[in-house]
Interface confidence: low
């Protein structure tokens, strides 16, 4: 019977776990042709809960570069341009799928991986814990 | 520059088409074991730019269910709990990778697809266009 390539150390599609290993065409189809990527590019600066973007690079991951948002302040920017600590800047997080090279350094063998990334920040009313 | 040596146990791939078709193990490795998924679950309600979450389901996509944020107001919620139209609620969007079944209905053949999703909303100072 046929198995997916089984050079030493390479993945194999075991019948028992099928379809554990699937074939993926990496020619990315981009559904975002009508969107302007710059449309939200300045929100990080104009937000009342501004953030900085940090480059997270990992050659063993696809995509290898992911941008992580870090909120600039614990509080939020008020109308006077000052930080108001009665409010909180919090990261909006999302679980995303990435491909992790497995075994390491293989150009065309991956495992699906779920990672949590911070996309931006929003300003929320803090939860106040009252002492009984 | 440094090149990481290719693992000799990697599946074969012709350079000409490399790496159009790759093997992907769908047993998801979750790096988020220490994160509490509920941690940010109420931000959508507590934010000064609150949002609703809409379920987007597509059986031909992996993951098949994606939650899309829609800002509730054009403006932001002020300290009095009213909508302040001097500020704007805007969606924070992110490009994410999903797997699209190709050909349709195939259980184990996919194409990588990039889609734009709204993760949440943030409150920004509006850009005021002055008339000359």
């Amino acid at each position: 019977g046929i198995t997916i390539p089984r050079n030493p150390g390479c993945p194999n599609s075991e019948d028992k776990n099928f379809p554990r290993t699937v074939m993926v065409n990496l020619n990315i189809h981009n559904r975002n042709t009508n969107t302007n990527p710059k449309r939200s590019s300045d929100y990080y600066n104009r937000s009342t809960s501004p953030w900085n973007l940090h480059r997270n690079e990992d050659p063993e991951r696809y995509p290898s570069v992911i941008w992580e948002a870090k909120c600039r302040h614990l509080g939020c920017i008020n109308a006077d341009g000052n930080v108001d600590y009665h409010m909180n800047s919090v990261p909006i997080q999302q679980e995303i799928l990435v491909l992790r090279r497995e075994p390491p350094h293989c150009p065309n063998s991956f495992r699906l991986e779920k990672i949590l990334v911070s996309v931006g920040c929003t300003c929320v009313t803090p939860i106040v814990h009252h002492v009984a | 520059g440094i090149t990481i040596p290719r693992n000799p146990g990697c599946p074969n791939s012709e350079d000409k088409n490399f790496p159009r078709t790759v093997m992907v193990n769908l047993n998801i490795h979750n790096r988020n074991t220490n994160t509490n998924p509920k941690r940010s679950s109420d931000y959508y309600n507590r934010s000064t730019s609150p949002w609703n979450l809409h379920r987007n389901e597509d059986p031909e996509r992996y993951p098949s269910v994606i939650w899309e944020a829609k800002c509730r107001h054009l403006g932001c919620i002020n300290a009095d709990g009213n909508v302040d139209y001097h500020m704007n609620s805007v969606p924070i969007q992110q490009e994410i990778l999903v797997l699209r079944r190709e050909p349709p209905h195939c259980p184990n053949s996919f194409r990588l697809e990039k889609i734009l999703v709204s993760v949440g909303c943030t409150c920004v100072t509006p850009i005021v266009h002055h008339v000359a």
């Epitope: 019977g1 046929i2 997916i4 390539p5 019948d15 028992k16 099928f18 379809p19 699937v22 074939m23 020619n27 | 599946p11 074969n12 791939s13 012709e14 000409k16 088409n17 159009r20 078709t21 190709e102 050909p103 349709p104 209905h105 195939c106 259980p107 184990n108 053949s109």
Partner: antibody, heavy 118, light 110 residues
Framework: EVQLLESGGGLVQPGGSLRLSCAAS????????MSWVRQAPGKGLEWVSA????????YYADSVKGRFTISRDNSKNTLYLQMNSLRAEDTAVYYC???????????WGQGTMVTVSS | NFMLTQPHSVSESPGKTVTISCTRS????????VQWYQQRPGSAPTIVIF?????PSGVPDRFSGSIDSSSNSASLTISRLKTEDEADYYC?????????FGGGTKLTVL
């Protein structure tokens, strides 16, 4: 080891019917789509029909649509091809194949001969 | 439906390299995987290349597959030819609801 064993072939008159079976072993049958491919004497390969692992989706070549029915019994690890209104041009060796992915026949049986002649 | 066109026959000497082409009549070849099957006389076909360029275990690295989107064609290349490579070779592709084989190419190792 994957094994596919076809049976049910034979001589049949034009307009007649025949039911082919394919007994599968060595793998989790219900996890795989299965196909029938035929080869007329001295000719090339021709895809006939395919069925999803659950049996919920079936596909047919235009040349057999409406006459042939593919089905499977996952409890018996068996694939079937019910052939009605047979014609002389249906004469061929019929192979059962396990699909690696849709449209990719990864493992093949040895085939069963079907002869349609008066 | 589309068709896959292959040369009827090719021949080459042992130790040499031979390439068999397969052209898709309509629909982009790049959108669907191409497979190659080997069939020796009196035997069932066996897959030698799947998903354009992937080799199943047990298939020698002398066999390689490629596609050329500009000509909408696929190729099977066999290097360091051996007498045991003499067989019929079929390319195969598909659409979302049907599967199509090429007419086959008879490879003669002189």
């Amino acid at each position: 080891e994957v094994q596919l064993l076809e049976s049910g072939g034979g001589l049949v008159q034009p307009g007649g019917s025949l039911r082919l079976s394919c007994a599968a072993s060595g793998f989790t049958f219900s996890s795989y789509a299965m196909s029938w491919v035929r080869q007329a004497p001295g000719k090339g390969l021709e895809w006939v029909s395919a069925i999803s692992g659950s049996g919920g989706s079936t596909y047919y070549a235009d040349s057999v649509k409406g006459r042939f029915t593919i089905s499977r019994d996952n409890s018996k690890n068996t694939l079937y091809l019910q052939m009605n209104s047979l014609r002389a041009e249906d004469t061929a060796v019929y192979y059962c194949a396990r699909d690696l992915i849709w449209g990719v026949a990864g493992s093949w049986g040895q085939g069963t001969m079907v002869t349609v002649s008066s | 439906n589309f068709m896959l066109t292959q040369p009827h026959s090719v021949s080459e000497s042992p130790g040499k390299t031979v390439t068999i082409s397969c052209t898709r009549s309509s629909g982009s070849l790049a959108n669907y995987y191409v497979q190659w099957y080997q069939q020796r006389p009196g035997s069932a076909p066996t897959i030698v290349i799947f998903a354009n360029n992937q080799r199943p275990s047990g298939v020698p690295d002398r066999f390689s597959g490629s596609i050329d989107s500009s000509s909408n064609s696929a190729s099977l290349t066999i290097s360091r030819l051996k007498t045991e490579d003499e067989a019929d070779y079929y390319c195969q592709s598909y659409s979302p609801s049907s599967v199509v084989f090429g007419g086959g190419t008879k490879l003669t190792v002189l």
